[in-house]
Interface confidence: medium
């Protein structure tokens, strides 16, 4: 039960690539508005995003302070006009979210591979550290300072001229592979945590490829 | 297997300088934040500054009782990082440590064996 | 700079007992404090981050609470294993340690 004429958000949903922290809800406000609500399990209820005709919220400040914690979340509905309208219980009507582990569950983003450097018969090839959200001390912390040793990429590399490919894994950002002489190849990256039970992978990162301006070469 | 190894400690006079090293190894230098932490005979641990990693383009920051005096510089071509110390004073006798900075949660996760510096006339 | 005072900075205890120590912010550093243990000849190790969370394979007779500029850490149930420093740690802005505190087992 709740207040005439407001409905109880519904279909809460986390939003989150590389800890950038979005909860969506519906419906799509008919004279009524929504305030969100974010704690850990032991924390205390903290409020974001007041009164608004929005039904999505951006969490990213709240759950960056601790990636490894579980939050919950919970929409208020309100009537347009009478906010201090409560329901029949003596409080705004109101939905929580699923519990959300920013560490366990963010989507890892597409990588970019950085660079590609041959020497010879081998190719270094570098993964951006690509840069999250989350901040400490004025440094915004890069995937690998967030995961750690959890991280690994994988490398898919071919010759131009064929589609058999070949993988590689580090759990750097660097790859040094084999390559023949004289050939080209392309590379595709993609993000890993083994460790993973959901989101485990990344998407593949755009395709590069030798002869194009991305790599540096050095034939010695 | 990480290592840290810090060089260069020994007797200087105060207003003196000295330049303490740490070799680092085991892991992707470039990618990590690197700091230096002191201890005072028979005194707490002091930060004493720290460089940030390849993502954050290498940059630095320093306590207040060091700033101006202290400059902390890498070579990752060397996997090192370098503790400038200039115009030294008593107080700044102490073993010092490198160590490798995780910045998330604020680890030193990995600590070198320390280098002691002892600044007297 | 932000200031830590940390008390106390000694203290003993026997085994079994419950153990608390705290430190004071200079300022509000939200809960950017982290405890670490030192003990002779070893690198110091982080116990708990972020006021609360205890570290990967620490045990949980290790606590921590407080926010803004009071904290505390605990030990709940002390252990011959337990004798050591600690040092309180903000991180909200740089870094600094607090003076530390030398538990001994009476």
């Known amino acids: 039960s709740g207040t005439t004429n407001t409905v109880a958000a519904y279909n809460l949903t986390w939003k989150s690539t590389n800890f950038k922290t979005i909860l969506e809800w519906e419906p799509k406000p008919v004279n009524q508005v929504y305030t969100v609500q974010i704690s850990t399990k032991s924390g205390d209820w903290k409020s974001k995003c007041f009164y608004t005709t929005d039904t999505e919220c951006d969490l990213t400040d709240e759950i960056v302070k601790d990636v490894k914690q579980t939050y919950l979340a919970r929409v208020f509905s309100y009537p347009a006009g009478n906010v201090e309208s409560t329901g029949s219980a003596g409080e705004p009507l109101y939905e929580n979210s699923p519990e959300f582990t920013p560490y366990l569950e963010t989507n890892l983003g597409q990588p970019t591979i950085q660079s590609f450097e041959q020497v010879g018969t081998k190719v270094n090839v570098t993964v951006e550290d690509e840069r999250t959200l989350v901040r400490r001390n004025n440094t915004f912390l890069s995937l690998r300072d967030v995961f750690g040793k959890d991280l690994i990429y994988t490398l898919y590399y071919w010759k131009s001229s064929s589609s058999g490919k070949k993988t590689a894994k580090t759990n750097t950002n660097e790859f040094l592979i084999d390559v023949d002489k004289g050939e080209n190849y392309c590379f595709s990256v993609q993000a890993v945590i083994p460790s993973r039970t959901v989101n485990r992978k990344s998407t593949d990162s755009p395709v590069e490829c030798m002869g194009q301006e991305k790599g540096e070469f050095r034939e010695i | 297997e990480v290592q840290l190894v810090e060089s260069g400690g020994g007797l200087v006079q105060p207003g003196g300088s000295l330049r303490l090293s740490c070799a680092a190894s085991?892991?992707?230098?470039?990618?990590?934040?690197m700091s230096w932490v002191r201890q005072a005979p028979g005194k707490g641990l002091e930060w004493v500054g720290f460089?940030?990693?390849?993502?954050?383009?290498?940059?630095?920051e320093y306590a207040a009782s060091v700033k101006g005096r202290f400059t902390i510089s890498r070579d990752n071509s060397k996997n090192s990082l370098y503790l400038q110390m200039n115009t030294l004073r008593t107080e700044d006798t102490a073993v010092y440590y490198c160590?490798?900075?995780?910045?998330?949660?604020?680890?030193?996760?990995?600590w070198g064996q320390g280098t002691l510096v002892t600044v007297s006339s | 700079d932000i200031q830590m005072t940390q008390s106390p900075s000694s203290l003993s205890a026997s085994v079994g007992d419950r153990v608390t120590i705290t430190c004071q912010a200079s300022?509000?550093?939200?809960?950017?404090l982290n405890w670490y243990q030192h003990k002779p000849g070893k690198g110091p190790k982080l116990l708990i981050y972020?006021?609360?969370t205890l570290q990967t394979g620490v045990p949980s007779r290790f606590s921590g609470s407080g926010s803004g500029t009071d904290f505390t850490f605990t030990v709940s149930n002390l252990q011959p294993e337990d004798i050591a420093t600690y040092y309180c740690l903000q991180y909200d802005n740089l870094l600094t340690f607090g003076q530390g505190t030398k538990l001994e087992i009476k």
């Open positions: 085991g892991f992707t230098f470039t990618e990590y934040h």
């Open positions: 460089i940030r990693n390849r993502a954050n383009a290498y940059t630095t």
């Open positions: 160590a490798r900075l995780t910045m998330v949660v604020a680890e030193f996760d990995y």
């Open positions: 972020y006021t609360s």
């Open positions: 300022q509000d550093i939200n809960k950017y």
